[in-house]
Interface confidence: medium
């Protein structure tokens, strides 16, 4: 079954290469277990950036080496992607799956265009 997922159209990463955005989903029921996946679309290629499964009311737990962190609040997930470079500029799509209890629901957002600008190197100082 499908559900709506909403996310901002555009986000600008900060000078440290960190971008944050909220992914919001229209939960048709009371899910207790939710899986959030961030996908990056460049041209026609879609790659998984990170994923986390969490229990409602608990923190999102990404893998230790993940570039993503996040928190949840109700039907909103606050996602932060770190370590971005200019070459990582692209469309970042939020996918939400309501894993438990049945029925299974899945929704995919329209994507957030994240712009990353590499900082200018500091000039040498005498």
């Amino acid at each position: 079954k499908a559900m709506h997922v909403a996310q901002p159209a555009v986000v600008l990463a900060n000078s440290r290469g960190t971008a944050s955005f909220v992914c919001e989903y229209a939960s048709p029921g009371k899910a207790t277990e939710v899986r959030v996946t961030v996908l990056r679309q460049a041209d026609s290629q879609v790659t998984e950036v990170c994923a986390a499964t969490y229990m409602m009311g608990n923190e999102l737990t990404f893998l230790d080496d993940s570039i993503c962190t996040g928190t949840s609040s109700g039907n909103q997930v606050n996602l932060t992607i770190q370590g971005l470079r200019a070459m990582d500029t692209g469309l970042y799509i939020c996918k939400v799956e309501l894993m438990y209890p049945p029925p299974y629901y899945m929704g995919i957002g329209n994507g957030t265009q994240i712009y990353v600008i590499d900082p200018e190197p500091c000039p040498d100082s005498d």
Epitope: A2, M3, H4, A6, V46, N110, G111
Partner: antibody
Framework: QVQLVESGGGVVQPGRSLRLSCAAS????????MSWVRQAPGKGLEWVAE????????YHSDTVTGRFTISRDNSKNTLYLQMSSLRAEDTAVYYC???????????WGQGTLVTVSS | DIQMTQSPSSLSASVGDRVTITCRTS??????LNWYQQKPGKAPKLLIY???RLHSGVPSRFSGSGSGTDYTLTISSLQPEDFATYYC?????????FGGGTKVEIK
């Protein structure tokens, strides 16, 4: 069955404001993103604005950004389009549409005509 | 914004003819391509969504195909009620954009 009924159109002078409404019924309004699409007389379709199911996010076309604001009241099952600083080129039939899960506008209202003329 | 080039802009056909309308997008849209039918003085109606899925209540003579940047709407056997204007629309990327329309007229 799904029904979308627009109202609020009419003749307005350039520079003035108007608010369109769209009353929705026959589905769970608060679970769907909604849009406004317009069609100038004898012309094609042009997307104007969209709002997420809860109203958290809204998006507007470049041609109306800063002048038009989309909003919704889920307790009243109603979608709105507040239009200000109206121009002659805003003259069109304005349609309210529901966006389904595969990004298609699956249901449309009958439209309401907005005429901007001095 | 993604540009939508729809062709032809108009065509004349007879009842029973096979009609094909094409839509080309300026960027890859991963199949988020929809087709609408509009009759004079009426609101558009959804025919095909996600490239090839038939909306409920739409006759099976309508079909859609395509991928990447090239998409097609086909009416296998034109009926009297099919004379109308047809629009393609993409929502692979914001903002959603429409083609210029194809008017199908009686020959």
């Amino acid at each position: 069955q799904v029904q979308l009924v627009e109202s609020g159109g009419g003749v307005v002078q350039p520079g003035r404001s108007l608010r369109l409404s769209c009353a929705a019924s026959g589905f769970t309004f608060s679970n769907y993103a909604m849009s406004w699409v317009r069609q100038a007389p004898g012309k094609g379709l042009e997307w104007v604005a969209e709002i997420s199911y809860s109203g958290t996010y809204s998006y507007h076309s470049d041609t109306v950004t800063g002048r038009f604001t989309i909003s919704r009241d889920n307790s009243k099952n109603t979608l709105y389009l507040q239009m200000s600083s109206l121009r002659a080129e805003d003259t069109a039939v304005y349609y309210c549409t529901r966006r389904d899960y595969d990004n298609e506008m699956d249901y449309w209202g009958q439209g309401t005509l907005v005429t901007v003329s001095s | 914004d993604i540009q939508m080039t729809q062709s032809p802009s108009s065509l004349s056909a007879s009842v029973g003819d096979r009609v094909t309308i094409t839509c080309r997008t300026s960027q890859v849209i991963t199949n988020y391509l929809n087709w609408y039918q509009q009759k004079p003085g009426k609101a558009p109606k959804l025919l095909i969504y996600y490239t090839s899925r038939l909306h409920s209540g739409v006759p099976s003579r309508f079909s859609g195909s395509g991928s990447g940047t090239d998409y097609t709407l086909t009416i296998s056997s034109l009926q009297p009620e099919d004379f109308a204007t047809y629009y393609c629309q993409q929502f692979g990327k914001r903002p959603p954009t429409f083609g210029g329309g194809t008017k199908v007229e009686i020959k």
